[in-house]
Amino acid sequence: KFSKQSWGLENEALIVRCPRQGKPSYTVDWYYSQTNKSIPTQERNRVFASGQLLKFLPAAVADSGIYTCIVRSPTFNRTGYANVTIYKKQSDCNVPDYLMYSTVSGSEKNSKIYCPTIDLYNWTAPLEWFKNCQALQGSRYRAHKSFLVIDNVMTEDAGDYTCKFIHNENGANYSVTATRSFTVKDEQGFSLFPVIGAPAQNEIKEVEIGKNANLTCSACFGKGTQFLAAVLWQLNGTKITDFGEPRIQQEEGQNQSFSNGLACLDMVLRIADVKEEDLLLQYDCLALNLHGLRRHTVRLSRKNPIDHHS
């Protein structure tokens, strides 16, 4: 709980925000968890704390580890943990999976690729963008604020996109790179009112207390690329991200095209360490597009241990 993974490359700047929510101006103390050693606030240090931010300017592989942040007040102390991993720079062009941020999808109508984590840094435009390590050139590519816009997107535009920018700290410049995959959705086809393939309406899913459980919300929306199509889970009518229970997370599955060519989406709801109170929640699989919204409700029930008779 209150823990967040962060990663970066050696000799680049890395800035990490305290995962524990505070408010601006509150004192935040940072510690290196393994030694309980306080992180200095003086900016002359290579690694220093600046309020809710922990700054590695630049980062070194040896900085990897868990950092504790405590948002302090006389009556409330809020503790969070930042799990930081600094990797060596790759000599070849391949960006390993562990350095990739979340994949984004685009189409002819919508082809924005946001540069991940950039809001944490003091940077100035323009961003540099690379695809599969090649600098992007040509009028089709437009670096706009913190995102890249690709005009007339084609399937060949799919790939790994890296943004590169300079973080400035007290007149010193540090390089930062971040990479994410971009997939392209086909524009041909048609759209239908969403059809939820799973779960069945009012399905009862048996789970074991203390074990992990997965629920898959799967729906189809038509053929070809779909404009505004989504599947998501809600808990008691609240979005998973807003519900705020760290044990319950949703994870986007793969886009699926069945043999009949329908465009379908999956969303997997992962419940870690199922608890009694989870059985009381209402789990709604929602599928929506421009035609409307369809909802299938699932309830959890306790799986009784199998009786063994001699």
Epitope: T75, R78, D242, G244
Partner: antibody, heavy 117, light 111 residues
């Protein structure tokens, strides 16, 4: 956005127990924050009653501690106030509010509870 | 308990003018470089709304016409310039220790 809504009886007889519930939407009460009860007698100022934090730990105003219980129902994302042995002096608008850290950041609309026979 | 005393109890201000409310604590609410004093606005029939936290920090979404200052035991909320819809009761609250307490309120009316 955190939203809070108080509910409960508007009229309680003297010596009985006042019971109110605050339903929270847009955020799980077990994720973080402290969840407060505050009251305001008609035409008067605000009085902090106490809170229950995300972990279930409670802190009460010593002036009311002997009569107050704050609890929660995590399955319904609700927290509750019980105030025993009420008198006419407990007549007030009762608010629930959430605290990110120190200050009361989000408030419910409040519910008027009248203590009268 | 820390007692918070607000003054004046009420004031009437013309639009465009400055309104100043003070809050005095019976003991210091400052420690470790911060002052744990907060200000709220309460309009008739509505719940209070946070305006200022830690004595001088403007809460997100609150107009810059509102400002706070002070440390130790003496704090000030300033509205400059006052607008017609600022008619409300204003409360200070400390979080230096338990129990949290509020001032008795200041009623601001617009002439």
């Amino acid at each position: 956005q955190v939203q809070l809504q108080e509910s409960g009886p508007g009229l309680v007889k003297p010596s009985q127990t006042l019971s109110l519930t605050c339903t929270v939407s847009g955020y799980s009460i077990t994720s973080d924050y402290a969840w407060n009860w505050i009251r305001q007698p008609p035409g008067k100022g605000l009085e902090w009653i106490g809170y229950i934090d995300y972990s279930g730990s409670t802190t009460y105003n010593p002036s009311l501690k002997s009569r107050v219980t704050i609890s929660r129902d995590t399955s319904k994302n609700q927290f509750s106030l019980k105030l025993s042995s009420v008198t006419a002096a407990d007549t007030a608008v009762y608010y629930c509010a959430s605290t990110v850290i120190d200050s009361m950041d989000y408030w419910g609309q409040g519910t008027l509870v009248t203590v009268s026979s | 308990d820390i007692v918070l005393t607000q003054s004046p109890a009420s004031l009437a201000v013309s639009p465009g003018q400055r309104a100043t409310i003070t809050c005095r604590a019976s003991k210091s609410v400052s420690t470790s470089g911060h002052s744990y004093m907060h200000w709220y606005q309460q309009k008739p029939g509505q719940p209070p709304k946070l305006l200022i936290y830690l004595a001088s920090n403007l809460e997100s979404g609150v107009p810059a016409r509102f400002s706070g200052s002070g440390s130790g035991t003496d704090f000030t909320l300033t509205i400059n310039p006052v607008e017609a819809n600022d008619t409300a009761n204003y409360y200070c609250q400390h979080s230096r220790e338990f129990p949290f307490t509020f001032g008795q309120g200041t009623k601001v009316e617009i002439k």
